[in-house]
């Protein structure tokens, strides 16, 4: 069945943008003037997820890349990772659950809780340049909430 | 306050145009997935479709081909260009703005515009 | 396409009267259901999300259950300001999105 997508680029409530560093991996760090150009475009597809109350899921891949965030257990942690996909059955309305987020959204603020592993969120350092995790605390110091932007084609 | 304010409506002739628009205030539309939905002289609700960003708009089967939502974020403004206009496209047009993106609920709407199809 | 069928068209009743609307899907759609009231000549408002939220500033007599394909909407005590017309309506992410066809309350 068909899945209702968008385009969109993510800022976390620094303003830090997110971009690729590296193949498999994204880092945040502020950027202006043409360097947005830099930040990362996702797809953030609706997909199929366990109910609870004003959670949504969605999968987040890159767009026009056959890559998707996913959680795995990596050393015994949750990790968040880019993993590569054929591009023939992604995105689907029934996606694995390592590619599902629950995402929250109050205030214009959003959160992305990794359905496989509850309370774990998408997470960025206070400080620059430093790769995008999952993170398993809320309100500390890392960065759990985010800022979506469409993006004009 | 934020709210929305639809117009454009008015009469037109079978195969006609019109374009009808919606502006918001109280907040930007660039950040919001709005919705058209219409309502036939004492029908129900149809949904004709949503627009998140420019290439992303979902239709009504119906509405496919003839109906086109596109955005104005300069001017904060959403637009329904309906084309090859018919009798039974006879209806208040209202614009609504999605609650949550994806939660497919509309919790702010406009107050309507009306269009009259025929000859 | 889903389809969303509403039942009764219309129904009767009274202040301080319980009162039961129900949907129903022609396939499965989880919890993703809303519910609308709508006055003569005014827009729809959201009244219940997710099947059983209540959206902000709705009273508390509105409540709703279901998932998969039955759904209901109940008013507890039915007040003067109730009498109109409720839809329900599929929603989350999916391609298409129906309404039910409609409730009439009368008093």
């Known amino acids: 069945a068909p899945v209702r997508s968008l385009n969109c680029t993510l800022r976390d409530s620094q303003q830090k943008s997110l971009v690729m560093s590296g193949p498999y991996e994204l880092k945040a760090l502020h950027l202006q003037g043409q360097d947005m150009e830099q930040q990362v475009v996702f797809s953030m597809s609706f997909v199929q997820g366990e109910e609870s109350n004003d959670k949504i899921p969605v999968a987040l891949g890159l767009k026009e890349k056959n890559l998707y965030l996913s959680c795995v257990l990596k050393d015994d942690k949750p990790t968040l990772q880019l993993e590569s996909v054929d591009p023939k059955n992604y995105p689907k309305k029934k996606m694995e659950k390592r590619f599902v987020f629950n995402k929250i959204e109050i205030n214009n603020k959003l959160e992305f809780e990794s359905a496989q592993f509850p309370n774990w969120y998408i997470s960025t350092s206070q400080a620059e340049n430093m790769p995008v995790f999952l993170g398993g605390t809320k309100g500390g110091q890392d960065i759990t909430d985010f800022t979506m932007q469409f993006v004009s084609s | 306050e934020v709210q929305l304010v639809e117009s454009g409506g008015g009469n037109v002739q079978p195969g006609g145009s019109l374009r009808l628009s919606c502006t918001a205030s109280g907040f930007s539309l660039s950040d919001a997935a709005m919705a058209w939905v219409r309502q036939a002289p004492g029908k129900g609700l149809e949904w004709v479709g949503i627009i998140y960003d420019s290439a992303s708009t979902f239709y009504a089967s119906w509405a496919k081909g003839r109906f086109t939502i596109s955005r104005d974020n300069s001017k904060n403004t959403l637009y329904l260009q309906m084309n090859s206009l018919r009798a039974e496209d006879t209806a208040t047009y209202y614009c609504?703005?999605?609650?949550?993106?994806?939660?497919?609920?509309?919790?702010?709407w406009g107050q309507g515009t009306t269009v009259t199809v025929s000859s | 396409e889903i389809v969303m069928t509403q039942s009764p068209s219309t129904l009767s009743a009274s202040v301080g009267d319980r009162v039961t609307i129900t949907c129903q899907a022609s396939q499965s759609i989880s919890s993703w259901l809303s519910w609308y009231q709508q006055k003569p000549g005014k827009a729809p408002k959201l009244l219940i999300y997710k099947a059983s939220t209540l959206a902000s500033g709705v009273p508390s007599r509105f409540s709703g259950s279901g998932s998969g394909t039955e759904f209901t909407l109940t008013i507890s005590s039915l007040q003067p300001d109730d009498f109109a017309t409720y839809y329900c309506q599929n929603a989350g992410g999916g391609v298409s999105i129906a309404f039910g066809q409609g409730t009439k309350l009368t008093v």
């Open positions: 609504a703005r999605e609650r949550n993106i994806f939660s497919g609920d509309m919790a702010l």
